[in-house]
Every structure is written in structure tokens, then in C-alpha cells.
Interface confidence: low
């Protein structure tokens, strides 16, 4: 008789999840000299230990502490780029602007980017059929708690001027319920962070509106100002040109507004 299995609302663990995490870890440590000391098998064991045999709606930040310890990494605190709902452009940017970092440019962010995972209470199995959905099932699921934990730590590490890339095509350019809005904004340290600079990325080529005046951006400014952090905002009207000018700042067309 097949054993009853909890059916969750979200997609199951990514296929070949253990192999993917291990392979990504090996690749990352090969590319990043300062992380060559990391033992990827230990990283996988700590990752697995955070959710295997545990109820996937009862995961805590403490469960991830062994993994956090193994993945401890120093990034230049004044070169942090946060993003919300515009991951691809943020990653293209840091590929070109080599000394800036998104969370996914760190070991732990790189390991988990775009992956889903969960286990089952009291069994050592990984659930490849379904995992809890944040809204429909529970918020304390393995994936959500992981990103909340690493995002908090990443924001806490930031200093000086912190940049955030926001999607100007969305109805809520700043969304209080996003990871940026619910975790990162509240964990920037006012004693270390002088300014949060938002880059609002425009979607349409003919869109010349000042999206820095959007009500949700004003809401972000209010939240940040109340935390004694300065706020500034820039419209990026031409994301394609923006990237090109990051690659080639000497280009004559890059002196005009982008």
C-alpha cells in the first residue's frame, strides 16, 4: 500500500537537487579564490540538514545556521546591489560591473538561485512531488526561510551607498511584500548605510515618465527616511543603453541621460 504523502500547492523539489547544489558549489569555489577553502560536501550536508526529516511548514532560521556558518563570505559592503522583481537585469549588471554584488553572486545565493526544495517530517526523503506554497500553504517553508535568512544577512552586511534595482513596469514598483520590501529594507543598518539609491528600470522605450514620483517609491522613501537612511532615486529610461554604458563608459552617447 503506498504511503500517504502530503500534497502541497507548490512545485516539488527541483530535479537532481542534491547534484545541482553540489555541482554549483564546486563551480563557485573554483571561480572564487577566497572560497576555495570551502568543503562542498560539508556544505551539502549542512543544506540537507536544514530541511530533511523536518516538517516543511515548520522550518526556522536556526535550521539554516550550520549552512550560514559554512557559507560565511565577505563581500565589499559598499558594493551591494539589491533588486526586486528584476533579477535578470541585476545579474547582467553585476556580470559587467565586476566589483558589485547581488545576493546571487555570493556562494549561498548562487547555490539556491531558481531552485525549490523540501523534505517530509520523519523521513529522510526529499519531496519531488510538491512543496509548500508561501501563500497557499505556509510561509515557514524551506525555500522561503532560506531566502529570508540569507537576504537578512546580506542587507545587514551592507554599508555606505546601497543600490536597489526596481522594476518600473510593475503596478507596485516597490512592493512591501517582496523580499526587498519585507526583509532587506528593514535590515539595512543605519549606522553603516548612508544612502539607499533606487534605480527604477523603465520597460517601454517611449516611457518618459518620472517613475521616482510613483506613490510606492514615495512609500519606500518614507520607510527609509524613518530609519535615518538617506534616499535617492534615478530613472533608467533605457536599460539596454544603461548596460552598454556600464560596459563602455567612454562611449560618447553615454553622457546623455539613460
Amino acid at each position: 500500500v503506498p504511503r500517504w504523502r502530503q500534497q502541497w500547492s507548490g512545485p516539488g523539489t527541483t530535479k537532481r537537487f542534491p547534484e545541482t547544489v553540489l555541482a554549483r558549489c564546486v563551480k563557485y569555489t573554483e571561480i572564487h579564490p577566497e572560497m576555495r577553502h570551502v568543503d562542498c560536501q560539508s556544505v551539502w550536508d549542512a543544506f540537507k540538514g536544514a530541511f530533511i526529516s523536518k516538517h516543511p511548514c515548520n522550518i526556522t532560521e536556526e535550521d539554516y545556521q550550520p549552512l550560514m556558518k559554512l557559507g560565511t563570505q565577505t563581500v565589499p559592503c559598499n558594493k551591494i546591489l539589491l533588486w526586486s522583481r528584476i533579477k535578470d537585469l541585476a545579474h547582467q549588471f553585476t556580470q559587467v560591473q565586476r566589483d558589485m554584488f547581488t545576493l546571487e553572486d555570493t556562494l549561498l545565493g548562487y547555490l539556491a538561485d531558481d531552485l525549490t526544495w523540501c523534505g517530509e517530517f520523519n523521513t529522510s526523503k526529499i519531496n519531488y512531488q510538491s512543496c509548500p506554497d508561501w501563500r497557499k500553504d505556509c510561509s515557514n517553508n524551506p525555500v522561503s526561510v532560506f531566502w529570508k535568512t540569507v537576504s537578512r544577512r546580506f542587507a545587514e552586511a551592507a554599508c555606505d551607498v546601497v543600490h536597489v534595482m526596481l522594476n518600473g513596469s510593475r503596478s507596485k514598483i516597490f512592493d512591501k511584500n517582496s523580499t526587498f520590501g519585507s526583509v532587506e529594507v528593514h535590515n539595512l543598518q543605519p549606522e553603516k548605510v548612508q544612502t539607499l539609491e533606487a534605480w527604477v528600470i523603465h520597460g517601454g522605450r517611449e516611457d518618459s515618465r518620472d517613475l521616482c514620483q510613483d506613490p510606492t517609491i514615495k512609500e519606500l522613501e518614507s520607510i527609509i527616511s524613518k530609519r535615518n537612511i538617506q534616499f535617492s532615486c534615478k530613472n533608467i529610461y533605457r536599460p539596454d543603453k544603461f548596460l552598454q554604458c556600464v560596459k563602455n563608459p567612454e562611449d560618447s552617447s553615454c553622457t546623455s541621460e539613460i
Epitope: K27, E30, I31, H32, P76, Q95, R98, D99, D105, K247
Partner: antibody, heavy 119, light 106 residues
């Protein structure tokens, strides 16, 4: 272990072109950018450009933009640097150097290829 | 382009002495990188992101600085430290190097 092995010394006449190769081994070629740097006798190091092997994206020092072309053959794990319209001041040792792209130094360098431009 | 000027051009010191090499940038840069080069050899990475020692570099080396002024310090010179040191910046294309400081035996 990581190795970058460059092609042998070249003697060229002014106006000619030279193509230097750099064969990588001991690591995944597409995971690292490949830079080209030259050093004229008694002079400082001079960065010429790089290629991202995984995407074929190149970026050049404007000084060489019209004369230098950096290419790669991923199947052979080899990068190439071609410099055209050679002049005597291009006489230098040319190095390839791999770069991990996240704020680090160029960590492994080829042995260097001496290019002499003389009539 | 950003011009990097190293001083002094030559530093004549004895083993055991402290060496201070400076690199001045014509415009502010985010970080400085340093390479060591010995005669007939390719440069070797020495310091990255201003203050991080590359793999295998002894702890007697240190790097510091910000903006337009950066320093490489050798607390107590060993015979193998005598070489040319180049600073380099990645902040603005073209990536540029200093003219080098030669640390020679007095």
C-alpha cells in the same frame, strides 16, 4: 594544475599582423574571462582587452580598438589575440591572463610571447 | 583614462627592513590590485580588492587605502621579496597599471 601555454616568439615587419594563441588547461575554460596584457621593454604593463569565453563578449582598450581582435575556440580551450598594422612600438612581450570576474586579480598568466616588429 | 603613479620608482632596502610602496590614482578608484614580477617571469597576483592577499602570499604583506591613494606594505623584507611591484585598477576602462616600484637589495 592550471596552465596557460602561449605560442612561440614572432618576428614581424611593420604593417603586418600577428596572432598569438593561449591554450588553457586544468580548469573549465568558459568559467573565466581571458585578458591580454603586453609589456614593452622596460615599460609598464598595458591591458589590451578581454574575452568572456562563455558568451564571446569582448571589451578592448580604446588605444587598440581598431587594431586588436580577441577570439576564442571553446572546443580547443584556446584564446587568440590578433594585432594588425604592426609598428615598432608594438615590440613587446604579450601575456594572456585568466580572470575570475568578481573583483579579483588576474590569477594565472601565460609564459608570455615575444613579438618583435622590425624592418 | 585613470593614470596610476607609483612611488618611489626604486626602493633600496636591506632584508628585515620595512617597505612602503604607494600608488596614486588620477581619479578615485574602488579598489586597488597589486602584482609582483621578477625578471624573465610573468606577473603574479599579490593583493586584490585593496587588502586581500592572493593565494600563497606571506602575511608580512598588507594592502590599504581608498579613493586615490593606496599602499602596499612589507613589514620585514625577506630575500624573495625583492622584485618589481605593479598596482592596477579595474574601476574604469581601460584597466591600467602603474609604472612599477622596484624593490632592490641595498
Amino acid at each position: 594544475q592550471v596552465q596557460l601555454v602561449q605560442s612561440g616568439a614572432e618576428v614581424k615587419k611593420p604593417g603586418a599582423s600577428v596572432k598569438v594563441s593561449c591554450k588553457a588547461s586544468g580548469y573549465t575554460f568558459t568559467n573565466y574571462w581571458m585578458n591580454w596584457v603586453r609589456q614593452a621593454p622596460g615599460q609598464r604593463l598595458e591591458w589590451m582587452g578581454y574575452i568572456i569565453p562563455s558568451t564571446d563578449y569582448t571589451e578592448y582598450n580604446q588605444k587598440f580598438k581598431d587594431r586588436v581582435t580577441i577570439t576564442r575556440d571553446t572546443s580547443a580551450s584556446t584564446a587568440y589575440m590578433e594585432l594588425s598594422s604592426l609598428r615598432s612600438e608594438d615590440t613587446a612581450v604579450y601575456y594572456c591572463a585568466r580572470y575570475p570576474y568578481r573583483g579579483y586579480a588576474m590569477d594565472y598568466w601565460g609564459q608570455g610571447t615575444t613579438v618583435t616588429v622590425s624592418s | 583614462q585613470i593614470v596610476l603613479t607609483q612611488s618611489p620608482a626604486t626602493l633600496s632596502l636591506s632584508p628585515g627592513e620595512r617597505a612602503t610602496l604607494t600608488c596614486s590614482a588620477s581619479s578615485s578608484v574602488s579598489y586597488m590590485y597589486w602584482y609582483q614580477q621578477k625578471p624573465g617571469q610573468a606577473p603574479r597576483p599579490w593583493i586584490y580588492l585593496t587588502s586581500n592577499l592572493a593565494s600563497g602570499v606571506p602575511a608580512r604583506f598588507s594592502g590599504s587605502g581608498s579613493g586615490t591613494s593606496y599602499t602596499l606594505t612589507i613589514s620585514s623584507l625577506e630575500p624573495e621579496d625583492f622584485a618589481v611591484y605593479y598596482c592596477q585598477q579595474w574601476s574604469t576602462n581601460p584597466w591600467t597599471f602603474g609604472q612599477g616600484t622596484k624593490v632592490e637589495i641595498k
